[in-house]
Amino acid sequence: AGVFELQIHSFGPGPGPGAPRSPCSARLPCRLFFRVCLKPGLSEEAAESPCALGAALSARGPVYTEQPGAPAPDLPLPDGLLQVPFRDAWPGTFSFIIETWREELGDQIGGPAWSLLARVAGRRRLAAGGPWARDIQRAGAWELRFSYRARCEPPAVGTACTRLCRPRSAPSRCGPGLRPCAPLEDECEAPLVCRAGCSPEHGFCEQPGECRCLEGWTGPLCTVPVSTSSCLSPRGPSSATTGCLVPGPGPCDGNPCANGGSCSETPRSFECTCPRGFYGLRCEVSGVTCADGPCFNGGLCVGGADPDSAYICHCPPGFQGSNCEKRVDRCSLQPCRNGGLCLDLGHALRCRCRAGFAGPRCEHDLDDCAGRACANGGTCVEGGGAHRCSCALGFGGRDCRERADPCAARPCAHGGRCYAHFSGLVCACAPGYMGARCEFPVHPDGASALPAAPPGLRPGDPQRYL
């Protein structure tokens, strides 16, 4: 048993052009939180499959409001580690998905809204009990910097947290073949059932049924000495009592090689022989090969035959990213109608609709004319998430149910008097004006500005507006 620990160092715009827009704004403040999902690394599982090793959610980060005009900085992060406890052995190779989520804190109906900002993924080799491993992953224009480690929970120890520690039975030393439990030097490894016949003095095991030899011994049961000399290290000052050369401090003391690397001395320094999946001077860099199966979602891995050569994932349709862990930005096609906000959740697209619209793509207008009648001969006109009635003459109001006063707007020009009429309004024009709204002056010579007065009407007569 043990705990996988993840420390997020920064989340912000990556290098290069095309800095991302800040996820928060003065109108819509937000805060970040993170989710980590762990799976045994050699299993071929899609990004959406269960987190077999465990998952954890961070606390919410501080509320952030964008400064207008400023570039998106590294965003404020939640405090503390993300911890994923594991009950069984640590698998050594694991896959991870780290998601950055945004919680919008504006006036949301029904509470805050969450949306996925970025998702990174990878497969790594990691020995429990080792140092923090640092990593940088990019998701689109965003960059996530983080460290991680796996540590065993007492009494478990070892690279897989399968060895057990127990308090010492004797105050001075541990029993044959058992070592002190670093860092708990006052405890000893509990004996495991090693391979039958494994030397109790010169052999030990980290897994049941194996037999690993202490320095100076070899063979399947650690019964064959490497050298007949009892002095195994020809270095350092001579010991007068034994005649042996007692080892002095060397560059490999304390084993500077991380992640299970083995140290060998060179004339000037030391050299680490790294296990598969790690490289660097001290095996501190985790390198992933195609054998580790780094491509998610059915991606095809090419190259990367050894840890020093890069692998490339050729992704199937709909997926992208260095590990095929990200879905293509389907929202760029703007599938949401009527101003709806598009959210690509991976397994599905979601549209957050504006008020007045509904449906999976905001295609239903809740305020449309369907089922709505405009009274008194009015006609319904849709638009902008609302409906309105274009009313027949003499009626007004939202549904044309109110009798309109046609004279309220003072439609008669030049001092004409307005009279309401069943079919509209009538203007009685002041002397010198004519027309339906008294808009035309009568010329002094008696000729109208109109080509001709309609038959039966003399200038100055009331003009009925039909």
Epitope: R330, L333, Q334, P335, L349, G359, P360, R361, C362, E363
Partner: nanobody, 120 residues
């Protein structure tokens, strides 16, 4: 299930033209949005051109004035007319469609892709 079948890809010289077609078939109630994405080696897939859910046309900045998207609603088909092709247009072009399979169920579908190579 909905199928998208692309055609029209091929090799062309810089400055040349190609016309891509994408036909949707299967249990289609209506097509909400439909368009073309492309993926060049080592680059992320990007939208080239498409008809949005609101029926508007949308183009990537890099293809405006050179590419034209059109559709035949009766045939559930979209076309991408590509002119003045450049080496940087070399990519696998994928058709994408957001399709209502009934009044209240909508899903996203991808075609298998068609390769467009622009080289002298």
């Amino acid at each position: 299930e909905v199928q998208l079948v692309e055609s029209g890809g091929g090799e062309v010289q810089p400055g040349g033209s190609l016309r891509l077609s994408c036909a949707a078939s299967g249990s289609i109630f209506s097509i909400n949005a439909m368009g073309w994405y492309r993926e060049a080696p080592g680059k992320q897939r990007e939208l080239v051109a498409g008809f949005t859910g609101d029926g508007m046309t949308k183009y990537a900045e890099s293809v405006k004035g050179r590419f034209t998207i059109s559709r035949d609603n009766a045939k559930n088909t979209v076309y991408l007319q590509m002119s003045s092709l450049r080496a940087e247009d070399t990519a696998v072009y994928y058709c994408a469609a957001d399709v209502f399979t009934d009044r209240d169920h909508v899903d996203w579908y991808w075609g298998q892709g068609t390769l467009v190579t622009v080289k002298p």
